[in-house]
């Protein structure tokens, strides 16, 4: 029985060349989180946080992705191509798989509002 909910930072915007924190939070379940996957809009894996093995950043993103804070992910040196959907996938037992969605908009302008509010997708 999947009782949990994923809260995410929702729709966020950040400045080109800057950095942004992607955050998800799993609540309302006692399930054990064994792994969290971070994926990009085209389904490519950015990073994995395994409960035993720790963080694994995929080679293509090693220069621009930093683990944390917590189970979150920090994207650095943002480009316009980083605009799009990001997904956090929580692998848990005994519940199974929970997935949260974040939409990131990278702005050209020198002033970009960084929204950090949490919302349930």
């Amino acid at each position: 029985m999947m009782t949990g909910t994923i809260e995410t930072t929702g729709n966020i915007s950040a400045k080109k060349g800057g950095s942004v924190i992607l955050q998800c939070h799993l609540s309302s379940t006692m399930a054990q989180v064994t792994q969290v996957n971070w994926e990009q809009h085209d389904h490519s894996l950015l990073a994995i946080r395994n409960a035993e093995l720790g963080w694994h950043i995929y080679p293509a993103f090693k220069d621009r992705v930093a683990p944390g804070p917590g189970l979150g992910l920090t994207l650095q040196s943002l480009t316009m191509n980083d605009t799009g959907e990001y997904f956090c996938t929580y692998h848990t037992y005994p519940d199974g798989t929970y997935r949260g969605r974040i939409f990131l908009e990278v702005l050209e302008s020198s002033v970009a509002e960084h929204s950090a509010r949490f919302q349930i997708p």
């Epitope: 064994t34 792994q35 996957n37 409960a51 035993e52 005994p94 199974g96 798989t97 997935r99």
Partner: antibody, heavy 119, light 107 residues
Framework: EEQLVESGGGLVKPGGTLKLSCAAS????????MSWVRQSPEKRLEWVAE????????YYSDTVTGRFTISRDNAKNTLYLEMSSLRSEDTAMYYC????????????WGHGTSVTVSS | DVQITQSPSYLAASPGETITINCRAN??????LAWYQEKPGKTNKLLIY???RLQSGIPSKFSGSGYGTDFTLTISSLEPEDFAMYYC?????????FGGGTKLEIK
């Protein structure tokens, strides 16, 4: 080349015990979670148990909880399934399988080892 | 547990044809369905996971679609080596459960 080789199957009486082994090669065994899946004589597949990469977390289907124990020895690149209080419905081909690094499926399977529970 | 109904259980087709195999879950499993191929004397092969993602090394003649409760495996331009047993499996929640299988045979 990734390879999984199961052994230890055989004929056992109801109530008996058996220990299956799965020898892994061709990949870094200690990085992957592993599962046991069985296939009944009627060809139905059933997930049996899973163990995390380091062995800290173990999960079981309700049908085997309390009777089966999954374990691993990363130094020996070997996965185990200890089965006790065996029943006729445990008769099946037992496969070990590797869970994908992203945890989404089972990407490599062994050829299986046959377990028959009969008096 | 999530129950998976796979259909048809038996399918006869000719080389060159395109076929579809369906799996239906009794409750939503999001996109989390995998497809496997089973052949005598060979180890089971992962074809598709997360509904539509092609496993590395699998030819693009295999494709998966679906979301929620209804999923489809499509195999185009059937070749002799494609005639085998196919299983779907949900990986959304524990226990992971499988469909009953589809035996694809040469007509």
């Amino acid at each position: 080349e990734e390879q999984l080789v199961e052994s230890g199957g055989g004929l056992v009486k109801p109530g008996g015990t058996l220990k299956l082994s799965c020898a892994a090669s061709g990949f870094t065994f200690s990085t992957y979670a592993m599962s046991w899946v069985r296939q009944s004589p009627e060809k139905r597949l059933e997930w049996v148990a899973e163990i995390s990469s380091g062995g800290s977390y173990t999960y079981y289907s309700d049908t085997v909880t309390g009777r089966f124990t999954i374990s691993r020895d990363n130094a020996k690149n070997t996965l185990y399934l200890e089965m006790s209080s065996l029943r006729s419905e445990d008769t099946a081909m037992y496969y070990c399988a590797r869970k994908t690094l992203d945890y989404y499926a089972l990407d490599y399977w062994g050829h299986g080892t046959s377990v028959t529970v009969s008096s | 547990d999530v129950q998976i109904t796979q259909s048809p259980s038996y399918l006869a087709a000719s080389p060159g044809e395109t076929i579809t195999i369906n799996c239906r879950a009794n409750k939503t499993i999001s996109k989390y369905l995998a497809w496997y191929q089973e052949k005598p004397g060979k180890t089971n092969k992962l074809l598709i996971y997360s509904g539509s993602r092609l496993q590395s090394g699998i030819p693009s003649k295999f494709s998966g679609s679906g979301y929620g409760t209804d999923f489809t495996l499509t195999i185009s331009s059937l070749e002799p080596e494609d005639f085998a047993m196919y299983y779907c499996q949900q990986h959304n929640e524990y226990p992971w459960t499988f469909g009953g299988g589809t035996k694809l045979e040469i007509k």
